[in-house]
Interface confidence: low
């Protein structure tokens, strides 16, 4: 059976595309939507049944320099009486984001994209129980 | 992190701020971390504030696929497996940076874009407003 010809197979590169050396890409780090703000419910990190704390990590050779990481406060979850229930588990919820890393090699500076895994908050889950034979 | 000291013989072009436009290596660090939350854990099903994951795809963006969480219930799941409306399932949102093709359709030219994603849900005690 003759395989039908695959159609137009690539984004047409517009004439306006900037020239870029091989193996690299041009990145404008002026952020689109820079002033967008998170509109999460108030103090959810304290009101959650799986509460968490925030830590700010700072690195001058990373853009953005500040990355906020959450850490679950408990192994278990907080019950209606305000006590920790260890029959349930507080677990971290994670999300990837991109950062730009600045590297110094001798007198030259290079830039590298990096995926960073950010812990955003915690959720309360029923544990998986493994039964040993 | 610390700023790596420069060789004293280097021209003094060190700038504490990042330049507006940079050329970056196409290779990405930590690129093999798992990007599909459905594959990385089943918390979305086991949580007391479970959520569904919706695929958001945009070929002009990297990553082209982002998963958005939507809480399944207003309340939370109690020990009996029922929805308890005395508690609230709320989304946990996070600003992340992605790459946007700029100009559009160009293979190797991007701009950073900040987007707001709902990553999962958590169960919270509601704020009760008492009306006088």
């Amino acid at each position: 059976r003759k395989i039908p010809k695959v159609g137009h197979t690539f984004f047409q590169k517009p004439e306006s595309c900037p020239p870029v050396p091989g193996g690299s890409m041009k990145l404008d780090i002026g952020i689109i939507n820079e002033n967008q703000r998170v509109s999460m419910s108030r103090n959810i990190e304290s009101r959650s049944t799986s509460p968490w704390n925030y830590t700010v990590t700072w690195d001058p050779n990373r853009y953005p320099s500040e990355v906020v990481q959450a850490q679950c406060r408990n192994l278990g979850c907080i019950n209606a009486q305000g006590k920790e229930d260890i029959s349930m588990n507080s677990v971290p919820i994670q999300q990837e984001t991109l950062v730009v890393r600045r590297k110094h090699q001798g007198c030259s500076v290079s830039f590298q994209l990096e995926k960073v895994l950010v812990t955003v908050g915690c959720t309360c889950v029923t544990p998986v129980i493994h039964h040993v034979q | 992190g610390i700023t790596i000291p420069r060789n004293p013989g280097c021209p003094n072009s060190e700038d504490k701020n990042f330049p507006r436009t940079v050329m970056v290596n196409l290779n990405i660090h930590n690129r093999n971390t798992n990007t599909n939350p459905k594959r990385s854990s089943d918390y979305y099903n086991r949580s007391t504030s479970p959520w569904n994951l919706h695929r958001n795809e945009d070929p002009e963006r990297y990553p082209s696929v982002i998963w958005e969480a939507k809480c399944r219930h207003l309340g939370c799941i109690n020990a009996d497996g029922n929805v308890d409306y005395h508690m609230n399932s709320v989304p946990i949102q996070q600003e992340i940076l992605v790459l946007r093709r700029e100009p559009p359709h160009c293979p190797n030219s991007f701009r950073l874009e900040k987007i707001l994603v709902s990553v999962g849900c958590t169960c919270v005690t509601p704020i009760v407003h008492h009306v006088a």
């Epitope: 695959v6 197979t9 690539f10 | 196409l26 690129r31 990007t35 599909n36 070929p59 082209s64 696929v65």
Partner: nanobody
Framework: EVQLVESGGGLVQAGGSLRLSCAAS??????MGWLRQAPGKEREFVAA????????YYADSVKGRFTISKDNAGITMYLQMNSLKPEDTAVYYC?????????????????WGQGTQVTVSS
């Protein structure tokens, strides 16, 4: 949906060569790639080529030994594998994707072939 059919796998001695082929039919794509999975390991990126054929990408572990190419019609993609090593033993998959963002991110490939076994004996 793109249909993909791989061929060309087999058993070869270390230092030998193989040529894999992948025939594509159906929807358009921006890039085609070869990915592999060794027993008990994660699926990993090997090489990719843009739909236009202008851009090729290789994993560090195969650079200089493997060459990816495609025919002018964009229907068949090839992976010429030279100087094969025992650690190249794996099931090799052909896959397509939209966008050339990071062709080495195996999670972003949408359509996969059934795979072809490559075994390199020492």
């Amino acid at each position: 949906e793109v249909q993909l059919v791989e061929s060309g796998g087999g058993l070869v001695q270390a230092g030998g060569s193989l040529r894999l082929s992948c025939a594509a039919s159906g929807r358009t794509y921006d890039a085609m790639g070869w990915l592999r999975q060794a027993p008990g390991k994660e699926r990993e990126f090997v090489a990719a080529i843009s739909g236009s054929g202008d851009d090729t990408y290789y994993a560090d572990s195969v650079k200089g030994r493997f060459t990816i190419s495609k025919d002018n019609a964009g229907i068949t993609m090839y992976l010429q594998m030279n100087s094969l090593k025992p650690e190249d033993t794996a099931v090799y998959y052909c896959a397509t994707r939209r966008g050339l963002y990071y062709v080495w991110d195996s999670n972003d490939y949408e359509n996969w072939g059934q795979g072809t076994q490559v075994t390199v004996s020492s």
